[in-house]
């Protein structure tokens, strides 16, 4: 057994209920809200996390628009419908039968409609731009050190392979992390960039989803990197369909 299995907790998701009722008495963890069994060696999907979070909703995420096709998450938190794999269902509806289509990170990408609304497919968010502003430091961080540290962080903490970290841009005090991942690029076991971005966002807000691990302690050559604000831009493989400019 791993240490996590010995005390039966889920290292990658504290919003779970765990018990030793898996095969051979092994620790098995289920996401709150949905009861879906999760793999605690990797990130839990954002859909299951949002479902679990609905028991104690926090402030909504804000997305900023880098171009005409970017989405702004003005709708805040909602209780999502997830498919058996834990992904967002393409169509989401609320209790009053208002429905809308979402992308793979659960952000609305169409006007709201009624139960007759059709969402043919779950459109993939293939490009995520994480825009950070760090607190003032004695001097600027070395760009290549910063790049290496962020790639290491995304691999070790979020299990995202560095191939999906397309670039790290830096103009003090702004850091931009570009994540790119087409559907065809994902191999078995590869973490989804949307899930990695969501975990990272929660970490920088001081709302870590990890069990028993300390909060995010980002250092570049020993110098603490403290994030003041985060903005996340999501771009889909197919542009969103709204009836008018928002």
């Amino acid at each position: 057994h791993t240490a996590a299995q010995d005390n039966c907790t889920c290292p990658t998701n504290k919003m779970t209920v765990c018990s030793p009722d898996g095969p051979g008495g092994r620790c098995q963890c289920r996401a709150l809200g949905s009861g879906v069994a999760v793999d605690c060696s990797t990130l839990t999907s954002e859909c299951l996390l949002l479902k679990a979070r609905m028991s104690a909703p926090k402030n909504a995420r804000t997305l900023v628009r880098p171009n005409e096709h970017a989405l702004v998450d003005n709708d805040g938190l909602y209780d999502p419908d997830c498919d058996p794999e834990g992904r967002f269902k393409a169509r989401q509806c609320n209790q009053t039968s208002v429905c809308w289509c979402v992308n793979s990170v659960g952000v609305r990408r169409t006007d709201k409609g009624d139960l007759s609304l059709r969402c043919d497919e779950l459109v993939r968010t293939h490009h995520i731009l994480i825009d950070l502003r760090h607190r003032p430091t004695a001097g600027a961080f070395n760009h290549s050190d910063l790049d290496a540290e962020l790639r290491r962080l995304f691999r070790e903490r979020y299990r995202l392979h560095p191939k999906f970290v397309a670039a790290v841009h830096y103009e003090q005090p702004t850091i931009q992390i570009e994540l790119r991942q087409n559907t065809s690029q994902k191999a078995a076991g590869d973490v989804d960039i949307g899930d990695a971005a969501y975990y990272f966002e929660r970490d920088v807000k001081g709302e870590s989803l990890f069990q028993g691990r300390g909060g995010l302690d980002l250092r570049v050559r020993g110098e603490p990197l403290q994030v003041e604000r985060t903005l996340i831009y999501y771009l889909d493989e197919i542009p969103p369909k709204f009836s008018m400019k928002r």
Epitope: S41, R155, Q185, G189
Partner: antibody
Amino acid sequence: QVQLQQPGAELVKPGASVKLSCKADGYIFTSYWMHWVKQRPGQGLEWIGEITPSDNYTSYNQKFKGKATLTVDKSSSTAYMQLSSLTSEDSAVYYCTRGHGNYVSFDYWGQGTTLTVSS
Amino acid sequence: DIQMTQITSSLSASLGDRVTITCRASQDISNYLNWYQQKPDGTVKLLIYYTSRLHSGVPSRFSGSGSGTDYSLTISNLEQEDIATYFCQQGYTLPPYTFGGGTKLEIK
């Protein structure tokens, strides 16, 4: 079932290049990472590099940069590793192995190709 | 790079014995530790992944445990077919992924 087929042996002269092959069967070739591992006689295992067949992304152990080049042919579900400027230090068994993105565990291995560099 | 150390390079045991092979990482690898068996003919097989998960088709006499930097592979009831060299490997950090030096298991 999953199979990775490699030729048993290759004999090449010092200074030459060789292209080792690894034919994948029993799974969707583009859905898994492919890794290559070196084992010198009586020694341990050494990771050379990895490739994703879907987009030809490669990453190498610094030690093998310039020595090994990984490629794939999706149409035949075959991975290749070219080794250049061969010396006696390159004489070894070379394994191809299928990898998992999260655990980075190598769940199926080829039988290995024994490369002998000799004049 | 993370160094993986298998202090015991060879081990002698009797059939039916309980055998434990250990592996130490140069830093915390958060359970991303895998174990492989290499038979004398060179055939390599995955036994255990993510510290303690048994790969499909592997007999239940094999088990893994550990955390942080220290990990172990246990064979609960040694059989003749288990005579092989065993390697640990970490998949935690950025490439390169590294292996231990191996532990050769022999029959007394």
